[in-house]
């Protein structure tokens, strides 16, 4: 189970047009349930109920997003329409080129995220949990478009924020 | 600030269909998702269905056959259609927002837009 | 689908009393229960959500309670501004169902 270094870049505008832009680092795991590999795309929070149904009619939201859920504890939500596996390859199937999961309340979903499959999906598959996964959700709390860069070994440069 | 404004036709013949706009301000779909509510006349509130970050979309299995929901990112509107109207669709119709970090219930809503559905 | 039972449709009481609702569920909905207020002729506003938790700029004098399928509303010290009525609701799974509503009127 390898460290996921996730960058998490915030877009903030100005009035006059120009904009700001946050970097925030955090780490997680790459699950075995995906592929051990870098990644990156806009944010999209993902409902727990929103990954239920399977729509073949529906289009694809796009590519190239990277799917964040917030797992609820086990006891809280004790009929899931899918396990955490299926939702992971739901969000695949609908576009997402990394999907994070915020393993917090949940721990149990680390093993079955862990358990070997014969069929991994091929996009990364990552699980954060206690003080990085707080920092991830006050980042999709800010209501700023983000986007998550997900890397296998540490970026280059510190986390700092920088004017554009 | 946050703001979702239902807008649509006041007054909608039987069989007909019904087209409502939402448009939102002060959040990002990515982050939430945005569903629909009614109310008729005098009674309580009905979800009708819900168009989530991702795009997709779930319904009332009741009304499934005539709803559709979708949106346009790009002009911060969600759409509405029933079709085949009948006059116990007459109401008001609700959009509002749900955070999808997690079980979150309706945290703001729309100011409505009445619809009567006559001949 | 998860049915909502809410009572009293109906009730009437003397400004600072305090006044309870209740909402049934048909089953356990693990404390994933809402209550909004709509005024007359406004939209309905978040009150309390997980059971308990008060929504941001929520008057401390409405509080909730209740597990498994049972569920109270109470508001302590009831005031003229609080005539509206009143809705529990089930967020966590389809169809998200609201319950059939209590309206509160001022003796």
């Known amino acids: 189970k390898e460290t996921a270094f996730v960058e998490v870049v915030l877009f903030e505008s100005s009035p006059s047009g120009d904009y700001t832009t946050y970097t925030t680092g955090l780490t997680g795991r790459f699950s075995r349930a995906g592929a051990t590999l870098s990644a990156e795309g806009e944010i999209v929070q993902m409902h727990p109920l929103g990954l239920c149904n399977n729509n073949d009619e529906e289009d694809l939201y796009e590519y190239g997003w990277v799917g964040v859920v917030k797992l609820e504890q086990p006891e809280l939500d004790p009929k899931p329409c899918l396990t955490v596996l299926g939702k992971a390859k739901r969000a695949v199937q609908r576009g997402a080129t990394a999907v994070i999961f915020d393993v917090s309340e949940n721990p149990e979903a680390i093993d079955q995220l862990n358990q070997g499959s014969e069929d991994p999906l091929k996009r990364p598959v990552v699980y954060v949990k206690g003080a990085d996964a707080i920092k991830l959700m006050n980042i999709v709390n800010k209501q700023k478009v983000a986007r998550a860069r997900i890397q296998h070994r540490p970026p280059r440069q510190p986390t700092e924020y920088f004017d554009m | 600030q946050v703001q979702l404004k239902e807008s649509g036709p006041g007054l909608v013949q039987p069989s007909q269909t019904l087209s409502l706009t939402c448009n939102v301000s002060?959040?990002?779909?990515?982050?939430?998702?945005v569903h629909w509510v009614r109310q008729p006349p005098g009674k309580g509130l009905e979800w009708l269905g819900v168009?989530?970050?991702?795009?997709?979309?779930d319904y009332n299995s009741a009304l499934k056959p005539r709803l559709r929901i979708s949106r346009d990112t790009s002009k911060s509107q969600v759409f509405l259609t029933l079709n085949s109207l009948q006059t116990e669709d007459t109401g008001i119709y609700y959009c509002?927002?749900?955070w999808g970090y997690g079980y979150n219930p309706f945290d703001y809503w729309g100011q409505g837009v009445m619809v009567t559905v006559s001949s | 689908d998860i049915q909502m039972t809410q009572s009293p449709s109906f009730l009437s009481a003397s400004l600072g009393n305090n006044i309870t609702i209740t909402c049934h569920a048909s089953?356990?909905?693990?404390?994933?229960l809402a209550w909004y207020q709509q005024k007359s002729g406004n939209a309905p506003e978040l009150l309390i959500y997980?059971?308990?938790s008060l929504q941001s700029g929520v008057p401390s004098r409405f509080s909730g309670s209740g597990s498994g399928t049972e569920y109270v509303l109470t508001i302590s010290n009831l005031q003229p501004d609080d005539i509206a009525t009143y809705y529990c609701?089930?967020?966590?799974?389809?169809?998200?169902?609201f319950g059939s509503g209590t309206k509160l009127e001022i003796k």
């Open positions: 509002n927002r749900m």
């Open positions: 002060g959040f990002s779909f990515n982050y939430y998702n």
């Open positions: 168009i989530w970050s991702g795009g997709n979309t």
């Open positions: 089953q356990d909905i693990k404390g994933w």
């Open positions: 997980k059971t308990s």
């Open positions: 609701q089930l967020y966590h799974s389809f169809p998200f169902t």
